[in-house]
Amino acid sequence: EEELQVIQPDKSVSVAAGESAILHCTVTSLIPVGPIQWFRGAGPARELIYNQKEGHFPRVTTVSESTKRENMDFSISISNITPADAGTYYCVKFRKGSPDTEFKSGAGTELSVRAKPSAPVVSGPAARATPQHTVSFTCESHGFSPRDITLKWFKNGNELSDFQTNVDPVGESVSYSIHSTAKVVLTREDVHSQVICEVAHVTLQGDPLRGTANLSETIRVPPTLEVTQQPVRAENQVNVTCQVRKFYPQRLQLTWLENGNVSRTETASTVTENKDGTYNWMSWLLVNVSAHRDDVKLTCQVEHDGQPAVSKSHDLKVSAHPKEQGSNTAAENTGSNERNIYGGSG
């Protein structure tokens, strides 16, 4: 009779994580008597996966009734495959004895595990940035195998090109991670914008995974200020308004100063939202002109989202009829202590 051969017909087998892997092995002869063992890897450090003779291998089942002498099929099924199971598996025939001695090995079957990438996590900068600034977004996904993977960045559906991507580790591994950093230039219209990281992998069957970041969490649009005055019914009263336009986020505090002295402070509440996601707000002062002997410098000072205050001033002429005028001068600390001013916001 011809000498026994151990046949592993599959050079490689690819299995999705969580599934079972069937590793085929047959022998060509019933002699010599002795057990079959399966190993992962070769050499002295090889790992025992299954021993026909003894041991407890809860994830391994034999495909045929391998306990019987007439059996020549020693294929095994390994359940609940994880990326850690990847490697080359050898079916090895031993000759019965004290000890059992290795008689012949199969050529090996390489098991590769297809593992899905985790959902991409997109993170933006720690601090908000203003339009025209470039900010960086990172995207991370882990645990996938094989290594080949495609990552794309989009802003509102438009593909971005300014990004760098790394897949780690560089060498062989049971699973891999991807890390990508994209640079995005902010515009004033980006409050409603989204940055999307899209990951495509063989395990996803053409349905890529996406991670998103809302630029509303990244952008700060500073307000523009406009101070105007309108006459009111009574000849000696003037209505001065401060229009705070196109700001984001909503957190805003406004202070009126009369000749450099704080007159009133209020927090933006009943704001109106623009189509682009920014907000507008208006605050007004009713000034009794007759109560002033000298000209009055009214300053609208706005502190937006914890940033340094910006202000707009308006010189109210007491001697002449009120007329609209404004200046960008900073508030002065000099001025009358006499007050006769009423205010509101809307």
């Epitope: 009779e1 019933l30 002699i31 008597v33 002795g34 057990p35 079959i36 026909q52 003779k53 003894e54 391998s66 306990t67 019987k68 002498r69 007439e70 059996n71 019965k96 004895g97 004290s98 000890p99 059992d100």
Partner: antibody, heavy 118, light 107 residues
Framework: EVQLVESGGGLVQPGGSLRLSCAAS????????MHWVRQPTGKGLEWVST???????YFPGSVKGRFTISRENAKNSLYLQMNSLRAGDTAVYYC????????????WGQGTMVTVSS | DIQMTQSPSSLSASVGDRVTITCRAS??????LAWFQQKPGKAPKSLIY???SLQSGVPSKFSGSGSGTDFTLTISSLQPEDFATYYC?????????FGQGTKLEIK
């Protein structure tokens, strides 16, 4: 059903010969090692002989040179030729199959009695 | 030849008892050990092979353990049909050899 049936036992004088047969059914006979085991009345079991799939044979010292084992796969039959029989060979002779991968005996026949006496 | 020594030679026990029979080999037999049950006038029946593997169709109340030279057969809860003679056998090295047997009797 897997079955082994021995035959050929009987009374024989010391120095005489006897040929035991074992008819196998219910399995692929050629794929299994086969064994003979005996048991003197009221005593324990003693292995007598093995024939492998390839026809290789094995005996203990107590019967070597006197007993021969053979198989006829086409007839699903196992044989034990016993020559130069002694009183100490008196026993029930069982045919058994090496049914497991490791050649452990899994199926036994009902036995046939061999008595060596003058 | 490898000597197989069983103990005890006989054992009295009651229905429901848990009993253990031991078998010692004179040298390492690499777990190639079988256990058999034999009732009077009947052929031996295989229970265990390679020291701890349960033969097909054998109830799980029978279990085998051990390695190297020392082995045990345990019957977890004796039933009337379990009273019989039990033999161990090494089949690692020719000549295959049996223990002298342990007779399990009803107390």
């Amino acid at each position: 059903e897997v079955q082994l049936v021995e035959s050929g036992g009987g009374l024989v004088q010391p120095g005489g010969s006897l040929r035991l047969s074992c008819a196998a059914s219910g399995f692929t006979f050629s794929s299994f090692d086969m064994h003979w085991v005996r048991q003197p009345t009221g005593k324990g079991l003693e292995w007598v002989s093995t024939i492998g799939i390839a026809g290789d044979t094995y005996f203990p010292g107590s019967v070597k040179g006197r007993f021969t084992i053979s198989r006829e796969n086409a007839k699903n039959s196992l044989y034990l030729q016993m020559n130069s029989l002694r009183a100490g060979d008196t026993a029930v002779y069982y045919c058994a199959r090496g049914g497991n991968w490791d050649d452990a005996l899994d199926i036994w026949g009902q036995g046939t009695m061999v008595t060596v006496s003058s | 030849d490898i000597q197989m020594t069983q103990s005890p030679s006989s054992l009295s026990a009651s229905v429901g008892d848990r009993v253990t029979i031991t078998c010692r080999a004179s040298q390492d037999i690499n777990n190639y050990l079988a256990w058999f049950q034999q009732k009077p006038g009947k052929a031996p029946k295989s229970l265990i092979y390679t020291a701890s593997s349960l033969q097909s169709g054998v109830p799980s109340k029978f279990s085998g353990s051990g390695s190297g030279t020392d082995f045990t057969l345990t019957i977890s809860s004796l039933q009337p049909e379990d009273f019989a003679t039990y033999y161990c056998q090494q089949y690692n090295t020719y000549p295959y050899t049996f223990g002298q047997g342990t007779k399990l009797e009803i107390k």
